[in-house]
Interface confidence: low
């Protein structure tokens, strides 16, 4: 049976999925889909990585972890009841039938109180060129095969990770506030 994860309406849901790259940066393609893992690929793909990067995602679905180290856990932002269901994380290891498949069940509960308004990140429409939220490692020399450790308790907020200062200014000028979680 699927491992079950819970979140409340308006919160961010977290669905863990990990693999160990052969070497840092030597990535394996991964897909996330809504629905149980089929024989091949992912159904209803919501996010996909290739050997180098995240190359496809849909609104509200993003990677919060250090995917270069194999943390391909999915974050679903500002969840609604309709987000309930099975999600498939598929690690697409080269070779025939070598894929690792994980089915994760997400249960969305009604909010206890009305959640504060949040800025919804619609990547493919409104702000499609933003950074994923990532922890900044120490400012030390980085060499091939050696990335700074990520302290997950110090993950930068979305506001600190807005890549485009123009977008940040737009948000400030509009009076919008950004709430993570």
């Amino acid at each position: 049976s699927e491992v079950e994860y819970r979140a409340e309406v308006g919160q961010n849901a977290y669905l863990p999925c990990f693999y160990t790259p052969a070497a840092p940066g030597n990535l394996v393609p991964v897909c996330w889909g809504k629905g149980a893992c089929p024989v091949f690929e992912c159904g209803n793909v919501v996010l996909r990585t290739d050997e180098r990067d995240v190359n496809y995602w849909t609104s509200r679905y993003w990677l919060n972890g250090d995917f270069r180290k194999g943390d391909v856990s999915l974050t679903i932002e500002n969840v609604i009841l309709a987000d309930s269901g099975i999600y498939c994380c598929r690690i697409q290891i080269p070779g025939i039938m070598n894929d690792e498949k994980f089915n994760l069940k997400l249960v969305i509960k009604p909010a206890k109180v009305t959640p504060a308004p949040t800025l919804q990140r619609d990547f493919t429409a409104a702000f499609p060129r933003m950074l994923t939220t990532r922890g900044h490692g120490p400012a030390e020399t980085q060499t091939l095969g050696s990335l700074p450790d990520i302290n997950l308790t110090q993950i930068s907020t979305l506001a600190n990770e807005l890549r485009d200062s123009r977008l940040a200014n737009d948000l400030r000028d509009s009076g919008a506030t950004i709430r993570i979680g």
């Epitope: 940066g25 180098r52 990067d53 995240v54 190359n55 496809y56 995602w57 270069r68 990547f123 493919t124 429409a125 409104a126 702000f127 499609p128 060129r129 933003m130 950074l131 994923t132 990532r134 900044h136 980085q142 060499t143 091939l144 050696s146 990335l147 890549r163 485009d164 200062s165 123009r166």
Partner: antibody, heavy 121, light 107 residues
Framework: EVQLVESGGGLVQPGGSLRLSCAAS????????IHWVRQAPGKGLEWVAD????????EYADSVKGRFTISADTSKNTAYLQMNSLRAEDTAVYYC??????????????WGQGTLVTVSS | DIQMTQSPSSLSASVGDRVTITCRAS??????VAWYQQKPGKAPKLLIY???FLYSGVPSRFSGSRSGTDFTLTISSLQPEDFATYYC?????????FGQGTKVEIK
């Protein structure tokens, strides 16, 4: 095989217009960002503009803002750079390049061969 | 705009030499720095991305590192095909900016 092929360059008078095309093959431009980078004769590289075809998001260098327009036709898997009010200082080889949507990793892994734009009377 | 100050602007070296090129960002750019190689009449080629990741197919004699806002491209043992111009680029903020280039010539 991933390929980018530019076309549309040529000689144009100051104040004139040109439209450059960047035809992509081997990948879907909807999953990436397409950039235009130029290089004046004997000079370094200068970023000009970019587009994320999936969302239509565009950005421009200050030096071309209001004069150049970047666009994409996902059905043709092609990006364009419409250049109006051209100036002598726009003379350069124009390259299109593939970038990534996550900006932290948005280095350019594939480039076209370049097309020369000469602005002269 | 973020300035990328690249040095030296040119250098002469021999086959087998260890070559180091540096780029200093005028403000924090995290690890959002790439290095490119360009030969005359050709398009640039990606060598290093995210400050220290070797791009697919690039020989392991090339490496990149970061120390704060200082970024370094190192060629451990220069080969004849490495004589070219090298550019750094930051892509942390708009506009993405390039260093002015370093021409590596044969001594």
């Amino acid at each position: 095989e991933v390929q980018l092929v530019e076309s549309g360059g040529g000689l144009v008078q100051p104040g004139g217009s040109l439209r450059l095309s960047c035809a992509a093959s081997g990948f879907n431009i909807r999953s990436y960002a397409i950039h235009w980078v130029r290089q004046a004769p004997g000079k370094g590289l200068e970023w000009v503009a970019d587009i994320t075809p999936a969302g239509g998001d565009t950005e421009y260098a200050d030096s071309v803002k209001g004069r150049f327009t970047i666009s994409a036709d996902t059905s043709k898997n092609t990006a364009y750079l419409q250049m109006n009010s051209l100036r002598a200082e726009d003379t350069a080889v124009y390259y299109c390049a593939r970038g990534y949507i996550y900006r932290m990793w948005d280095s350019y892994d594939y480039w076209g061969q370049g097309t020369l734009v000469t602005v002269s009377s | 705009d973020i300035q990328m100050t690249q040095s030296p602007s040119s250098l002469s070296a021999s086959v087998g030499d260890r070559v180091t090129i540096t780029c200093r960002a005028s403000q924090d750019v995290n690890t959002a720095v790439a290095w490119y190689q360009q030969k005359p009449g050709k398009a640039p080629k990606l060598l290093i991305y995210s400050a220290s990741f070797l791009y697919s197919g690039v020989p392991s004699r090339f490496s990149g590192s970061r120390s704060g806002t200082d970024f370094t491209l190192t060629i451990s043992s220069l080969q004849p095909e490495d004589f070219a111009t090298y550019y750094c680029q930051q892509h942390y903020t708009t506009p993405p900016t390039f260093g002015q280039g370093t021409k590596v010539e044969i001594k």
